[in-house]
Amino acid sequence: FPQDRPFEDTCHGNPSHYYDKAVRRCCYRCPMGLFPTQQCPQRPTDCRKQCEPDYYLDEADRCTACVTCSRDDLVEKTPCAWNSSRVCECRPGMFCSTSAVNSCARCFFHSVCPAGMIVKFPGTAQKNTVCEPASEPDYYLDEAGRCTACVSCSRDDLVEKTPCAWNSSRTCECRPGMICATSATNSCARCVPYPICAAETVTKPQDMAEKDTTFEAPPLGTQPDCNPTPENGEAPASTSPTQSLLVDSQASKTLPIPTSAPVALSSTGK
């Protein structure tokens, strides 16, 4: 390291420099009270004030005490360095509810997701656990830019026709052998058994597929109007993509969440 007796000829007899044998070059001699930031300083900016342990040099060139992580609920995230404070964070299993400079003023235990909810995002030192319903609903972005619950096809008489996507709802249709008696947005509110008809029989009820209508079953003993089975073998179902929410046993509320944010229900209600 710096030699007591620099080779004057090597450093041109300059008292502000010394010869360091280890790196074989002339180094700038930091003024008294200043300490080098590297083994062989080259200029005054390579020298700095040295602070006592547990102090750091702040932006104003002042020695400032590093924060302590001595509280039971805190752990050290980054150590005290010459130019930066120690940083404390809440210990595992806790999150910070009230932050403080380089530390946390109040730590709380992570919430446990209540019954019917599962962990969507585990708790961190900064954030509480984020919970979501254990089953559906899931969500899509509607035309208004709102996160909207996809319809559920969990009823026994429904099957999924198209899945829930980021920009479109799941669509449901009546399961084979059933026909939609009361249509609903992206689904069917009421499925009824498909009528048994002779081949080449009469026409379907007027505008059945186009409108949210209720098909009244004919009186007993009368022959209903029958449609030929569609070419793909599926019973007709309303899939008009109108942006209203399905109101059924699985209905879920629309959450006005920013489009970039993941949707989550916090167990703390926040």
Partner: antibody
């Protein structure tokens, strides 16, 4: 409490040698530059030598080549090896902590060095 | 011959304001902080003013320092008998530290 305690002073003949020590306590010794400042009887203060990190040394022209400053951080002790002593080196030698921007913020009580035949 | 020039003596009566001057050059006072030390009779020096005009904790606000160009001064207001001491100015200079010759302050009466 910061304390600096010098020792090693005494009477020595011209051309002789003496080694002063300064035991430091109450602060993190290795984090500070240290200095020796002397005061001849009835005279003013004169800075003699300083040591920084970890072996940077600084000397007044009047002692260059004759005095050597050193430190042992493990023992929290500062030393001044004085060789080829002269009558004009007679003085009370103070050990002082030097903190950049703050100057000599703590001083020892001093140890008297007398160079006389 | 000291690098920094101070008047050898100064005096004042209790309650008075006294100023001690310190003159240097561009290589010391002109480009660095000025420090003032007080040395009471028979004791080690004590830091009185650092960074031209800052007082360490415990130093009364009767003591104040100032610097202008290559000169500095120490002012003591409300002079007290216990202020009788030697006062030294000092400054860093490239790779050494220089003191003034010292000013002996006498409190009269």
């Amino acid at each position: 409490e910061v304390q600096l305690l010098e020792s090693g002073g005494g009477l020595v003949q011209p051309g002789g040698s003496l080694r002063l020590s300064c035991a430091a306590s109450g602060f993190t010794f290795s984090s500070y530059s240290m200095s020796w400042v002397r005061q001849a009887p009835g005279k003013g203060l004169e800075w003699v030598s300083g040591i920084g990190y970890p072996y940077y040394t600084y000397y007044a022209d009047s002692v260059k080549g004759r005095f050597t400053i050193s430190r042992d951080n493990s023992k929290n002790t500062l030393y001044l090896q004085m060789n080829s002593l002269r009558a004009e080196d007679t003085a009370v030698y103070y050990c002082a902590r030097y903190y950049y921007d703050y100057g000599f913020d703590y001083w020892g009580q001093g140890t008297l060095v007398t160079v006389s035949s | 011959q000291s690098v920094l020039t101070q008047p050898p003596s100064a005096s004042g009566t209790p309650g008075q304001r006294v100023t001690i001057s310190c003159s240097g050059s561009s290589s010391n006072i002109g480009s660095n902080y000025v420090y003032w030390y007080q040395q009471l009779p028979g004791t080690a020096p004590k830091l009185l003013i650092y960074r031209n005009n800052q007082r360490p904790s415990g130093v009364p606000d009767r003591f104040s320092g100032s610097k202008s160009g290559t000169s500095a001064s120490l002012a003591i207001s409300g002079l007290r008998s216990e202020d009788e001491a030697d006062y030294y100015c000092a400054a860093y200079r490239s790779y050494d530290y220089v003191f003034g010759g010292g000013t002996k302050l006498t409190v009269l009466g």
